[in-house]
């Protein structure tokens, strides 16, 4: 009488290496009949079905980049890592395998290694702006982190500008930099009782960004849409707004408008509005970072043109909602015509299906929601400026909704903002 | 100005294929802003649309039930212009038929240019 | 699909007179509906769209009202140049066109 057995594994060990060390075996034994295969892997990588270096002895297979072995011999099974790294520590798992069944266990390999440290070298900021200069650190075991500036430990009575955070995988150094002496050198040093790691940072003194160049000038009755191209330097932070400045030729005041960076850049254009038809304008541009307001560009000449009458279609961004079947529908105004917009009109449809009613908008929304709609389905959306002289040409504007979830959030009618 | 110039045979046999044209001038066939259409007027029937072809960053088609399995219009935008095609015809397809653009670019909607027309008899 | 009845079918009026013509949907169409006027032997002509919004050069004499499912074109003042046949067209879903009201003049 055959009596045959689930695989069992009776014996595995956790391991501590050095990182840099030669090599560490971690071990697994199994029971059972017939008698179990085993295979190894990790979270991230299966062993065992890698494509082998050498396949001439089964009982010994070695991966393609000659970091692990696994040798197997009768009941036991031994994977070897050679020249340990510290990205090799975590958890394995060997599980034995017959025609019968299988049993899998976990083992861990502890790595002992020297910091590591990495993090942004050069930061930037400028008199009166605190900024924090972040030195992330990898160790095992954790290591302590000390800061220091020309040789000196922070923080010190010589620097009550600076204050120390730490967290277990990183050590934030807040600095408000009160006056030129601030800015410079700062050292990160990370100590473990395997070895240490130092890290050397710059804060740089930010600067007002260069000036934007005016590329090109499209001039409506009582609007102009200026192109530009953005500064070649940014002074080392981000640019948060841009300022238009015009005036009539003749006269000596600068009109200004200020518009977020963020918009302005998308396109490289800013509209400016409240002009006079068949009027010639100058118009110059700055932009403004944490530190300030940067150079003026040189100015750019333009000519408005005699009224049209009606707006120009206004321009249409989409942004699909989370739910999948919405959309906010941004109206971007453009010339009004050289009299104001009334409303917007708006009127959408799934492809070969039917309209749905005519949404009216005033003057002043620059977005309308459409709510609740088709799911998986092509939109078609239109919409016209309408102002005393009458409407726009139509903007249109085409797209899909997602296809349906499985469970359907509640949506209301469409919205205007 | 817009005009639509239709042109095709007025005589069609009975199981045979109707097949009009029409030409666009002033205006495109491939307009994100409007919608080309096949219209018919018959005594019986009186004014019955048949089907449009319009682009909307692709081309759509959309065919009244009554014609669809028989129906195909076509845009040609290197000739500017589009065509009707109405397979195994029979006397009920005798019809004066018209092609028209619906406009939305001025917000119109409706069919504001209408072809001049062309009467298509079934017989054999 | 959806229905247009139209009526009177024929309306008979003298030069001056006020003609008043009905358009019924068998469903809302919202204002998406369009007055044609066609003549004998030519295409029907643009009158009205939107319900009350009078197409380009088309005399002010016309005009139109309603919406949902009922609606009227008028001529405040009948001229001879006014007879033929009347259409009502809807374009909220797959186009439909009603019968037709005739206009002559007495």
């Known amino acids: 009488l055959k009596v045959f057995a689930k695989p069992k594994i009776t014996y595995v060990e956790n391991q501590t290496a050095m990182e840099l060390e030669e090599q560490v075996t971690l071990t697994c034994e199994a029971s059972g009949d017939p008698i179990p295969s085993i295979t190894w892997r990790t979270s991230t990588r299966n062993i065992s079905s890698e494509e082998k270096a050498s396949w001439t002895r089964p009982e010994k297979q070695e991966t393609l980049d000659g970091h692990m072995v696994v040798r197997s011999h009768a009941r036991v099974s031994s994977l070897t890592l050679k020249s340990i790294q510290y990205t090799d520590a975590g958890e394995y798992i060997c599980t034995a395998s017959n025609t019968i069944g299988q049993d899998s266990q976990s083992m861990y390999l502890e790595v002992q290694y020297a910091p590591k440290l990495q993090g942004p070298v050069a930061v930037y900021t400028w008199e009166g702006n605190q900024v924090n200069i972040t030195c992330e650190v990898f160790a095992y075991p954790s290591a302590t982190i000390s800061w220091f500036r020309d040789g000196q430990l922070l923080p010190s009575s010589n620097y009550s500008n600076i204050k120390i955070y730490n967290t277990p995988s990183a050590s934030y150094l807040e600095v408000t930099p009160d006056s030129e002496n601030d800015f410079g050198n700062y050292n990160c040093t990370a100590v473990n009782r395997i070895g240490q790691e130092s890290l050397e940072f710059i804060l740089v003194q930010a600067d007002t960004p260069s000036s934007p160049s005016i590329d090109q000038v499209e001039p409506y009755s009582s609007t102009a849409q200026v192109q530009f191209d953005e500064p070649e330097a940014t002074g080392g932070v981000p640019i948060l707004k841009y300022k238009a400045e015009w005036r009539a030729v003749g006269e000596e005041v600068w009109h200004s408008k200020w518009y977020d960076a963020k918009e302005a850049s998308m396109e490289g254009i800013v509209t400016i509005v409240g002009l006079k038809p068949e009027t010639t304008y100058a118009v110059r541009l700055a932009a403004l970072n944490g530190k300030g307001l940067g150079e003026i560009s040189a100015a750019s000449e333009f000519k408005t043109q005699p009224v049209q009458g009606e707006p120009s279609a206004p321009k249409l961004e989409g942004q699909m909602g989370e739910d999948g079947n919405s959309i906010k529908v941004n109206l971007i105004k453009q010339d009004d015509g050289g009299s104001p917009i009334r409303h917007y009109l708006v009127r959408y449809r799934a492809l070969s299906s039917e309209w749905k009613p005519e949404i009216r908008l005033p003057s002043g929304s620059d977005h309308v929601m459409l709510k609740s709609l088709d799911w998986n389905a092509e939109y078609e959306v239109y919409v016209v400026a309408e102002n005393q002289q009458g409407k726009s040409k139509a903007a249109h504007f085409v797209f899909r909704t997602s296809a349906q979830p499985t469970a359907i959030p509640a949506n209301g009618s469409p919205t205007s903002g | 100005q817009v005009q639509l110039q239709q042109s095709g045979p007025g005589l069609v046999k009975p199981s045979q294929t109707l097949s009009l044209t029409c030409a666009i001038s002033g205006d495109s066939v491939s307009s994100n802003s409007a919608a080309w259409n096949w219209i018919r007027q018959s005594p019986s029937r009186g004014l019955e649309w048949l089907g449009r072809t319009y682009y909307r960053s692709k081309w759509y088609n959309d065919y009244a039930v009554s014609v669809k399995s028989r129906i195909t219009i076509n845009p040609d935008t290197s000739k500017n212009q589009f065509s009707l095609q109405l397979n195994s015809v029979t006397p009920e397809d005798t019809a004066v038929y018209y092609c028209a653009r619906e406009n939305i670019a001025a917000w119109t909607w409706a069919f504001d240019i209408w072809g001049q027309g062309t009467m298509v008899t079934v017989s054999s | 699909e959806i229905v247009l009845t139209q009526s009177p079918a024929t309306l008979s009026l003298s030069p001056g007179e006020r003609a008043t013509l009905s358009c019924r949907a068998s469903?809302?169409?919202?204002?998406?509906l369009a007055w044609y006027q066609q003549k004998p032997g030519q295409a029907p002509r643009l009158l009205i769209y939107?319900?009350?919004n009078r197409a380009t050069g088309i005399p002010a004499r016309f005009s139109g009202s309603g919406s949902g499912t009922d609606f009227t074109l008028t001529i405040s003042s009948v001229q001879a140049e006014d007879v033929g046949v009347y259409y009502c067209?809807?374009?909220?879903?797959?186009?439909?066109f009603g019968q037709g009201t005739k206009v002559e003049i007495k």
């Open positions: 469903q809302s169409v919202s204002s998406y």
């Open positions: 067209q809807q374009y909220h879903g797959t186009p439909t």
């Open positions: 939107d319900a009350s």
